[in-house]
């Protein structure tokens, strides 16, 4: 029988060194044997280039194209190729569809006066243009409580977050996850973090009742306590105002 | 020592043929595109073709169009000009020269980095 | 096709002072940051032509830093400073964004 595409190919660039196209075929389909994405930049001398695809489900292709670090003017003719059958033609320009890559290496430490502090790495290097686009979301949630979870819009630069332990709830295990996207791109969401877990420790202050009441401060610089004010304010933010954003 | 040597200029009359020969030395051959230039006598500079490492695109320009076809073989180190329907005002000198590096995805541009030292092709009856 | 129109067609400097050539393209010639495609070639009397500057203002291997070029878009210059004997030739800019490559019509160097 004839070889038909379904939902012709959806493209998204890391801006950097790869794009992936993803595609449907109208019956269960062997990517790798049978059909081929050609891709060439339009640009004087530009070479073709072949992409062999993967089966992401039973007749869902994928194609993971190496390109150079990306630039706005790039453009890419882009044709799906069962043997000598044409089956779709296209153009691509990885600037107007961006998904950046996905934040690295989260990490939770504990932090001075009941703080935690979330990590992680910015996955473009300091030369690339998304390096310094990029805003995430942090979702921390409760392993134990679906109802119990939060979500953090980092906007200001530097990949961390600094969460009271006193939003969390007391000797819960709680988990964090991280996603990236660049504004002015208008970017879709990178796919998240893996998860990083840790048990929220802090003791509320009532339990303190006649102990000695260490002074929450002590040692917080006032960048630091600003952090804190900031991220609450951002998760009552969120909270209010989710609708309007997601 | 990079190195381009040209060959294969002639006198030849008009609707006549030609292929101009250029073997290159020094550099990997296939990983750039080449170009040829013509210069007509006093005149200045008319890029006339152009051939991507593999060989897998090619332009022209208008005047030339139809009428020459660039060629390379890279086991060779040799890039060629079929000039067919040969005219008056093809006669120019002819240079070959070393283009972008086309293995990348986007060519790099260093522009016409390497010359050759050119052979006359005179079209007259 | 995009046309590039050089000035002036002749000049005439005395050696050590800084001599100035003008080309303008009939259309951007930036792809990205920092990529003009507009290069410079001396072709000297009896010679083959030879790269000096590409990319607007990149020297090519082996360009005295006396030769510089700048400019962005549309209008590039090339600049030889302490113009000596040898710089006597023809001046050429190219486009090499697209095809046809094209070239100006050139710019003849004398050294008084």
């Known amino acids: 029988g004839s070889v038909k595409v379904l939902h012709e190919p959806s493209c998204f660039s890391d801006y950097i060194s790869t794009s992936v196209c993803q595609w449907k075929m109208d019956h269960p389909t062997n990517c790798s044997a049978e059909l081929r994405l050609s891709y060439q930049l339009d640009f004087m001398g530009s070479e073709n280039h072949t992409c062999v695809p993967e089966n992401r489900e039973d007749s869902v292709c994928v194609c993971s194209m190496p390109i150079d670090d990306a630039v706005e003017a790039d453009v890419y003719q882009l044709d799906l190729w069962a043997g000598q059958q044409l089956l779709w033609s296209g153009s691509f320009q990885p600037s107007k569809h961006v998904k950046p890559r996905t934040p690295g290496n989260l990490t939770v430490h504990p932090n001075i006066s009941h703080t935690w502090l979330l990590m992680w790495t910015n996955p473009y290097p300091t030369e690339n243009h998304l390096h310094s686009e990029l805003t995430y979301m942090v979702n921390v949630s409760n392993d134990n409580d679906p109802e119990d979870f939060k979500v953090y819009n980092v906007t200001y630069m530097g990949p961390t977050l600094r969460l009271a332990a006193s939003t969390l709830k007391s000797g819960a295990s709680y988990s964090a996850r991280v996603r990236a996207w660049a504004q002015t791109y208008n970017s879709t969401w990178s796919d998240w973090s893996p998860s990083t877990t840790w048990l929220n420790y802090y003791e509320p202050w009532e339990q303190h009742l006649g102990k000695p009441i260490p002074n929450p401060l002590l040692g917080l610089d006032s960048t630091g306590l600003n952090d804190i004010f900031e991220a609450q304010k951002i998760e009552w933010h969120e909270h209010h105002h989710h609708h309007h954003h997601h | 020592e990079v190195q381009l040597v040209e060959s294969g200029g002639d006198l030849v009359k008009p609707g006549g043929s030609l292929r101009l020969s250029c073997v290159a030395s020094?550099?990997?051959?296939?990983?750039?595109?080449m170009t040829w230039v013509r210069q007509a006598p006093g005149k200045g500079l008319q890029w006339v073709s152009f051939i991507s490492g593999s060989g897998g695109k090619t332009y022209y320009a208008d005047a030339v169009k139809g009428r020459f076809t660039i060629s390379r073989d890279n086991a060779k180190n040799t890039l060629y000009l079929q000039m067919n329907s040969l005219r008056a005002e093809d006669t120019a000198v002819y240079y070959c020269?070393?283009?972008?590096?086309?293995?990348?995805?986007?060519?790099?541009?260093?522009?016409?980095?390497?010359w050759g030292q050119g052979t006359l092709v005179t079209v007259s009856s | 096709d995009i046309v590039m129109t050089q000035t002036p067609l002749s000049l005439s400097v005395s050696p050590g002072e800084t001599a100035s050539i003008s080309c303008r393209s009939s259309q951007s010639l930036l792809y990205s940051i920092g990529y003009n495609y507009l290069d410079w070639y001396l072709q000297k009397p009896g010679q083959s032509p030879q790269g000096l500057i590409y990319?607007?203002?990149k020297r090519a291997s082996g360009v005295p830093d006396r030769f510089s070029g700048s400019g962005s878009g549309t209008d590039f210059t090339l600049r030889i400073s302490r113009v000596e004997a040898n710089d006597t030739g023809v001046y050429y800019c190219?486009?090499?964004?697209?095809?046809?490559?094209?070239f100006g019509q050139g710019t003849k160097l004398e050294i008084k």
């Open positions: 190219m486009q090499g964004l697209q095809s046809p490559l094209t």
């Open positions: 020094g550099f990997t051959f296939r990983d750039y595109a």
């Open positions: 990319l607007g203002s």
């Open positions: 020269a070393v283009d972008r590096l086309t293995k990348t995805i986007r060519p790099q541009y260093y522009g016409l980095w390497v």
